[in-house]
């Protein structure tokens, strides 16, 4: 609450997060032309990426393009990309939607369709839908420990969200345990009025707001965090503005002296930890 | 503008960026002692790195040291590093400029020069100039989509820079389309009075400032972003303070049971998105 | 100092860091059943990770789990994890402490102990102590160059911590060179009253605070940074809240057509650069 007589100072904050959980993923795996059901285990080293300070990322879904090589090939026949003759293909042209640079030739993509040939990582990425349900939908049960150290330098005051009295096997609950800083990912979504299973397919951005409203006067001292949650990406976003949250990364390797890569389009939740508030003192 | 009767509150912000573009890179490639011109395609997975929240990086140039192995070898004969006898080489010494730990021996680097032997990733990185023009100079034509969600918790007000009415095929222009949040990298540099082609060689840091000056009173409501651009690294910086922007990373692999790495010195532009402003309400 | 007649504005900041140093690491290496002493060199590409804006990470210690494969195996017999019969093992159960999903069978871990079989990356990570002393304890002698560009947009004022007059071979010292922005990591710890050698074992978070108290009035202009240091993680933290600072990452590879990974549990110091302050002008 506003105490007009107080000198207010914004919070200086540092955050450290630790995600825990294992996901079992079942997907169709094609080897030597044969498709069969594959099971695999994903742990933190597989689904999260180190070191983001005030945000962390949990992969909930993915599409892989394996064994890509730099060469020439027909581009993927997405809407409006097909051709019937070389005239439709412009040498040196890079369509922002495409994944390569056109050679100027119109070539067969398959039995029925022709597309412009491109110089690219081939075969080019198929523009297929993200798997539904999401492959790592069980990430809903992962937990994240959030450690937050705050400082009001002008008041020479430091504290943190985890107190020595706290229990490391707690789980945050708005009513029963509002000071616990271990959060189940599914609960964060529920608190924000969002459906984890749905968002996990395309990915999204979730805000974890930590509000410190600190009264540092000795006679009425109070300085504990309040947690709240809200979705930060626009779920009603037009397709052209790239809804959800995904990024591509590659694993490079050599096979028979040929440089190859596996391209992973990773969908997931980026959690942004937004720390704000003030410290007031007479 | 300052309305003194209003209660002002700083903005809480979350940013999501998406870079698009393909670069064709032509460089000399040496294989089996034969040097020939090599062409390769770089897409987002090759030139950018995932997940940086308020900043993103686009690689515009690079120097590779391939097939490095942990062993002993002569260090690179940079200025002041040559020796004529073992006395000049100090066992266990790590010169901050060097890439290894001296063994104490002065050994031939080539026909004419001798340098101190080091325990290091060998052969040690050659201190050669960044290629000029930059290998990915065509990154000037890449575009970045910036999504910015802002919140004034005290006023319980949330909005974002992308409105449902916006067109996903727009490109930002200060006069013709100042609300479009898709930016051509070359345009950002032009707006900041900088030369992309030049900066791309050594790398640099570019600030994209998003200023929200929000009047949240219902009778004169206004809350839209204003974009501006300025270079953040010092282009006149002394050599000793590492001008430009680069970092080294490695790709590790095994060959004939020997642990090897390719060291990449990546030069590029780090774009920092600096969001600031206030929300005022009676 | 507070000048009440001035219009105060918070600082907008951008940070760029560059770490320098080489570490020689000596550890026991087991190959073909034979254990011998191995020496290796770590340079920036080996111990630090690119691109964190306001924070950077230096690995000071690690534990490796090499050659893991996705299959079935007994889980690690940590406290409370042993079993005597299948009844103790619940098919499909994921213990948050475990590294896999139970199959429901109780199987031999070694001659004397049995544990629940899991579907996991096998053999599962041994829960062994971080090496003591830390493997990269010599990181104490690494240096970091910090470049900080600041902006007060309302006052249209920009400056940086590195001035043209500065000497690139300086090292920060509170008394003798308080404006030098090259810091020895060990000195940062000493200034904060912490023991680098000790913290390097489990890792930790260190804050580098840069305070700008700027008087922008022309008649008494002053705008230079003040550096201070404080530890941000809680050294007295209960085991259940994960003391120190570590994360796991993996290097994936194929051997005889089998997908494998080396899991690295990296301990280290995350340095958070916390820039704050105000610019005041009549």
């Amino acid at each position: 609450s506003d105490k007009l007589y107080q000198r207010k100072e914004p919070v200086i904050s540092s955050v450290h997060t630790k995600v825990k959980g294992i996901a079992e993923v079942t997907e169709n795996v094609t080897e030597g032309g044969v498709t069969k059901l594959g099971h695999s285990i994903f742990d933190t080293a597989d689904y999260t990426f180190p070191l983001q300070g005030n945000s962390f990322f949990v992969m909930t879904n993915y599409v892989k393009s394996e064994g890509q090589v730099q060469t020439l090939c027909p581009e993927y026949p997405r809407r409006g990309a097909q051709c019937s003759s070389d005239r439709r293909c412009k040498k040196g042209w890079m369509d922002p939607q495409s994944k390569g640079i056109q050679t100027g030739r119109c070539v067969p993509y398959d039995k029925t369709r022709k597309t412009c040939e491109v110089s690219a990582w081939c075969p080019t990425e198929e523009e297929k839908e993200a798997p539904r349900p999401a492959l790592l939908r069980s990430a809903e049960n992962f937990t994240v420990l959030i450690k937050n150290n705050i400082h009001f330098p002008g008041h020479n005051y430091t504290t943190r969200n985890i107190l020595p009295t706290m229990n490391g096997s707690c789980t945050f609950h708005k009513t029963w345990d509002p000071q616990c800083s271990i959060f189940r990912l599914g609960d964060i979504f529920q608190e924000a009025g969002e459906n984890f299973t749905e968002v996990a397919v395309q990915g999204g951005i979730m805000g974890i707001e930590i509000y410190w409203d600190c009264n540092l006067d000795s006679w009425s001292h109070h300085c504990r965090p309040r947690y709240s949650f809200r979705r930060l990406d626009d779920k009603n976003m037009d397709e052209s503005f790239v809804p959800g949250y995904n990024f591509r990364y590659a694993k490079y390797y050599k096979e028979n002296n040929v440089e190859k890569r596996t391209l992973i389009k990773a969908f997931g939740i980026r959690f942004d930890i937004l720390v704000f508030g003030t410290g007031g003192k007479f | 503008s300052d309305k003194l009767y209003q209660r002002k509150e700083p903005v809480i912000s979350s940013v999501h960026t998406k870079v698009k573009g393909i670069a064709e890179v032509t460089e000399n490639v040496t294989e089996g002692g034969v040097t020939k011109l090599g062409h390769s395609i770089f897409d987002t997975a090759d030139y950018t790195f995932p997940l940086q929240g308020n900043s993103f990086f686009v690689m515009t140039n690079y120097v590779k040291s391939e097939g490095q192995v942990q062993t002993l070898c002569p260090e690179y004969p940079r200025r002041g590093a040559q020796c004529s006898s073992d006395r000049r080489c100090k066992k266990g010494w790590m010169d901050p400029q060097s890439k290894g730990i001296q063994t104490g021996r002065c050994v031939p680097y080539d026909k004419t020069r001798k340098t101190c032997e080091v325990s290091a990733w060998c052969p040690t990185e050659e201190e050669k100039e960044a290629p000029r023009p930059a290998l990915l100079r065509s990154a000037e034509n890449f575009t970045v989509l910036i999504k910015n969600n802002i919140h004034f918790p005290g006023h319980n007000y949330t909005t974002r820079n992308i409105l449902p009415t916006m067109n996903g095929s727009c490109t930002f222009h200060k006069t013709w389309d100042p609300q479009c949040s898709i930016f051509r990298l070359g345009d950002i540099f032009q707006e900041a009075g900088e030369n992309f082609t030049e900066v791309a060689v050594q790398g640099g840091i570019m600030g994209i400032e998003i200023y929200w000056d929000c009047n949240l009173d219902s009778w004169s409501h206004h809350c839209r972003p204003r974009y501006s651009f300025r270079r953040l690294d010092d282009k006149n910086m002394d050599e000793s303070f590492v001008p430009g922007y680069n970092f080294r990373y490695a790709k590790y692999y095994k060959e004939n049971n020997v642990e090897k790495r390719t060291l990449i010195k990546a030069f590029g532009i780090r774009f920092d998105i600096l969001v600031f402003g206030t929300g005022g309400k009676f | 100092s507070d000048k009440l007649y001035q219009r105060k504005e918070p600082v907008i900041s951008s940070v760029h860091t560059k770490v320098k140093g080489i570490a020689e690491v000596t550890e026991n290496v087991t190959e073909g059943g034979v254990t011998k002493l191995g020496h290796s060199i770590f340079d920036t590409a080996d111990y630090t990770f690119p691109l964190q804006g306001n924070s950077f990470f230096v690995m000071t210690n690690y534990v490796k789990s090499e050659g893991q494969v996705q299959t079935l195996c007994p889980e690690y017999p940590r406290r409370g994890a042993q079993c005597s019969s299948d009844r103790r093992c619940k098919k499909g159960w994921m213990d948050p402490q475990s590294k896999g999903i139970q199959t429901g069978r109780c199987v031999p871990y070694d001659k004397t102990r049995k544990t629940c079989e899991v579907s996991a990356w096998c053999p599962t990570e041994e829960e062994k102590e971080a090496p003591r002393p830390a493997l990269l304890r010599s990181a104490e002698n690494f240096t970091v160059l910090i470049k900080n560009n600041i902006h007060f947009p309302g006052h249209n004022y920009t400056t940086r911590n590195i001035l043209p007059t500065m000497n690139g071979s300086c090292t920060f010292h509170k008394t003798w060179d308080p404006q030098c922005s090259i810091f020895r990591l060990g000195d940062i710890f000493q200034e904060a009253g912490e023991n680098f050698t000790e913290v390097a074992v489990q890792g930790g978070i260190m804050g580098i605070e840069i305070y700008w108290d700027c008087n922008l009035d022309s008649w008494s202009h002053h705008c230079r940074p003040r550096y201070s240091f404080r530890r941000l993680d809680d050294k007295n933290m209960d085991e259940s809240f994960v003391p120190g600072y570590n994360f796991r990452y993996a290097k994936y590879y194929k051997e005889n057509n089998v997908e494998k990974r080396t899991l690295i549990k990296a301990f280290g110091i995350r340095f958070d650069i916390l820039v704050f302050g105000t610019g005041g002008k009549f």
């Epitope: 090589v69 060469t71 090939c73 030739r105 067969p108 398959d110 | - | -």
Partner: nanobody, 115 residues
């Protein structure tokens, strides 16, 4: 699924020549040849993109083998000269999406080079 029919295999003396042909049931971007010697894994020999651009050869056959495409007939041929005993194998025709990527293989035709 693409049907592939190879022809032209046989017995030839070291140093001799042989021409293999293959017809596909439908048009495809790339066509190529693989081979498998007894007790060894199947290996790539040569590949050709649409209209013979680009072409790619295994190091072991460069300068001795030539691949050529006939787009109109959905066909590919492999002219092999300077044959060596180590070229002995079953040769398979294949089609795919680039000169590095193949999805469908024929039944194979035997090539034996005697010394």
């Amino acid at each position: 699924e693409v049907q592939l029919v190879e022809s032209g295999g046989g017995l030839v003396q070291a140093g001799g020549s042989l021409r293999l042909s293959c017809a596909a049931s439908e048009r495809t971007y790339s066509m190529g040849w693989f081979r498998q010697a007894p007790g060894k894994e199947r290996e790539f020999v040569a590949g050709s993109g649409w209209d013979g651009i680009p072409t790619r050869y295994a190091d072991s056959v460069k300068g001795r083998f030539t691949i050529s495409r006939d787009n109109a007939k959905n066909a590919v041929s492999l002219q092999m000269s300077g044959l060596k005993p180590e070229d002995t194998a079953i040769y398979y025709c294949a089609t795919g999406t680039s000169v590095y990527h193949y999805q469908y293989w024929g039944q194979g035709t035997q090539v034996t080079v005697s010394s």
